[in-house]
C-alpha cells in the first residue's frame, strides 16, 4: 500500500504545529522531566512496511486521544489545536486504508499486536504522569516535547523503511 505523498507533508505539518503549540520554555520545567520509555524498537524491528503501518496508526490514534481531552483543550491554543486535530485525522485516514489493505499480509500478526500494546502502554504512562502532575503547564510542556520526539522518531523510521522498498 502506497501512502499518498501528502502523508509525509502531513507528518511535517503535525510536527510544526506541535512546535508552535509551545507555551513555556522546557528549561523552566527541568524538574518535571520524565522518561516515558518510548518503545522505539517496535518501529525498528518491523521489517516490512505493512507491519509498521498499523503501529504508526496506533501511535497517531493515541496522540489524537491524548490531545482531544478536556484537560488538553484547557492547556493549548484552540486554533492550533483544531489544526492539529485536522492533520492527525487526515493521517489516520491515509493509514487506515493501508491497515485494511494490509490485513493478513504481515509475517507475524501477533508481533504487530504486541507492538500496538507497547504503544498503548507508552501512552498509559504519559496519561498517568499528567494525572500525577495534576495537568500542570510544565507537565503538558514535557508531554508536548515528548510527543514531538517520539512522533518524529516513528515517522522517520517509517520513512526509512519506505525508502528501502
Amino acid at each position: 500500500c502506497d501512502l499518498p505523498q501528502t502523508h509525509s507533508l502531513g507528518s511535517r505539518r503535525t510536527l510544526m504545529l506541535l512546535a508552535q503549540m509551545r507555551r513555556i520554555s522546557l528549561f523552566s520545567c527541568l524538574k518535571d522531566r520524565h522518561d516515558f520509555g518510548f518503545p522505539q524498537e517496535e518501529f525498528g524491528n518491523q521489517f516490512q512496511k505493512a507491519e509498521t503501518i498499523p503501529v504508526l496508526h496506533e501511535m497517531i490514534q493515541q496522540i489524537f486521544n491524548l490531545f482531544s481531552t478536556k484537560d488538553s483543550s484547557a492547556a493549548w491554543d484552540e486554533t492550533l489545536l483544531d489544526k492539529f486535530y485536522t492533520e492527525l485525522y487526515q493521517q489516520l485516514n491515509d493509514l487506515e486504508a493501508c491497515v485494511i489493505q494490509g490485513v493478513g499480509v504481515t509475517e507475524t500478526p501477533l508481533m504487530k499486536e504486541d507492538s500496538i500494546l507497547a504503544v498503548r502502554k507508552y501512552f498509559q504512562r504519559i496519561t498517568l504522569y499528567l494525572k500525577e502532575k495534576k495537568y500542570s503547564p510544565c507537565a503538558w510542556e514535557v508531554v508536548r516535547a515528548e510527543i514531538m520526539r517520539s512522533f518524529s522518531l516513528s515517522t522517520n523510521l517509517q520513512e526509512s523503511l519506505r525508502s528501502k522498498e
Epitope: 509475517e107 507475524t108 501477533l110 500496538i116
Partner: antibody, heavy 117, light 113 residues
Framework: HVKLQQSGAELVKPGASVKLSCTAS????????IHWVKQRPEQGLEWIGR????????KYDPNFQGKATITADTSSNTAYLQLSSPTSEGTAVYYC??????????WGQGTTVTVSS | DIELTQSPATLSVTAGEKVTMSCKSS????????????LTWYQQKPGQPPKLLIY???TRESGVPDRFTGSGYGTDFTLTISSVQAEDLAVYYC?????????FGAGTKLEIK
C-alpha cells in the same frame, strides 16, 4: 489487581442464541486484545477469535465464522461472545482471555454452556 | 493453518523427577524481524482455566517457578520441568502465537504416580 469475570452458566435450546459476557477489572479493555477460547468436556482448547476493543476489529477461526460474534463495550469494560444457533457440539466451557502484555496472560474463570432440548 | 503436535499424550512420573514434553509445528514459528519464536505454553490444572507459563518459546511469565523451562527454535519446541512437584499435575498445551487462526496442541497430561 487484574481480573476477568465471566457470566454464569447457561442452558440453551438447540438453535437458540446465547450471549456470554466477560468484564475486566484492574485494566482498561481498550488497551488490550480480548480472546475467546472453547473447551469441550474432556477435550483440548479451541481458539474462537479475538477483538481489539479500541476499534472493534475482530478475527475469527474460520470454523467459528458466522457461528460466533465477538463484541465489546468499552464503557462497561466488557467483552461479549454471542453463539448463534448452537448444536450439541456447542456444549463446552467458554473462556475469555486478555492479551495485556504477551500471549493470553489473563483468563476468566470460564462459562459453562449446555446445549440441550 | 498451523498444526501443533504434542507428545507424549500422557506422562506418568514420580515427584522429583525431570520431565520433558515436545511440541512440533507444521511450519516455522520464528519471526525474522525480531528473531523470536512465537510459541506459547499453558498449564491447565483440573477445574481451572489455563495459565500462561512461557511465551516466545523460552520466556517465563512472571511468577512461574524456575523449574519450568521452555526451549526450541523454528518448528521443534520442548517444555521441561526440572523437578516435578505434586502441584504440577495438569495438562500442558502449546499454542501457535505466530499467525491467525491461533491454534493449540492437543495437550500433554502430566500424572503424578
Amino acid at each position: 489487581h487484574v481480573k476477568l469475570q465471566q457470566s454464569g452458566a447457561e442452558l440453551v435450546k438447540p438453535g437458540a442464541s446465547v450471549k456470554l459476557s466477560c468484564t475486566a477489572s484492574g485494566f482498561n479493555i481498550k488497551d488490550t486484545f480480548i480472546h475467546w477460547v472453547k473447551q469441550r468436556p474432556e477435550q483440548g482448547l479451541e481458539w474462537i477469535g479475538r477483538i481489539d476493543p479500541a476499534n472493534g476489529y475482530t478475527k475469527y477461526d474460520p470454523n467459528f465464522q458466522g457461528k460466533a460474534t465477538i463484541t465489546a463495550d468499552t464503557s462497561s469494560n466488557t467483552a461479549y461472545l454471542q453463539l448463534s444457533s448452537p448444536t450439541s457440539e456447542g456444549t463446552a466451557v467458554y473462556y475469555c482471555a486478555s492479551r495485556v502484555d504477551y500471549a493470553m496472560d489473563y483468563w476468566g474463570q470460564g462459562t459453562t454452556v449446555t446445549v440441550s432440548s | 493453518d498451523i498444526e501443533l503436535t504434542q507428545s507424549p499424550a500422557t506422562l506418568s512420573v514420580t515427584a522429583g523427577e525431570k520431565v520433558t514434553m515436545s511440541c512440533k509445528s507444521s511450519q516455522s514459528l520464528l519471526n525474522s524481524g525480531n528473531q523470536k519464536n512465537y510459541l506459547t505454553w499453558y498449564q491447565q490444572k483440573p477445574g481451572q482455566p489455563p495459565k500462561l507459563l512461557i511465551y516466545w518459546a523460552s520466556t517465563r511469565e512472571s511468577g512461574v517457578p524456575d523449574r519450568f523451562t521452555g526451549s526450541g527454535y523454528g518448528t521443534d519446541f520442548t517444555l521441561t520441568i526440572s523437578s516435578v512437584q505434586a502441584e504440577d499435575l495438569a495438562v500442558y498445551y502449546c499454542q501457535n502465537d505466530y499467525s491467525y487462526p491461533l491454534t493449540f496442541g492437543a495437550g500433554t497430561k502430566l500424572e503424578i504416580k
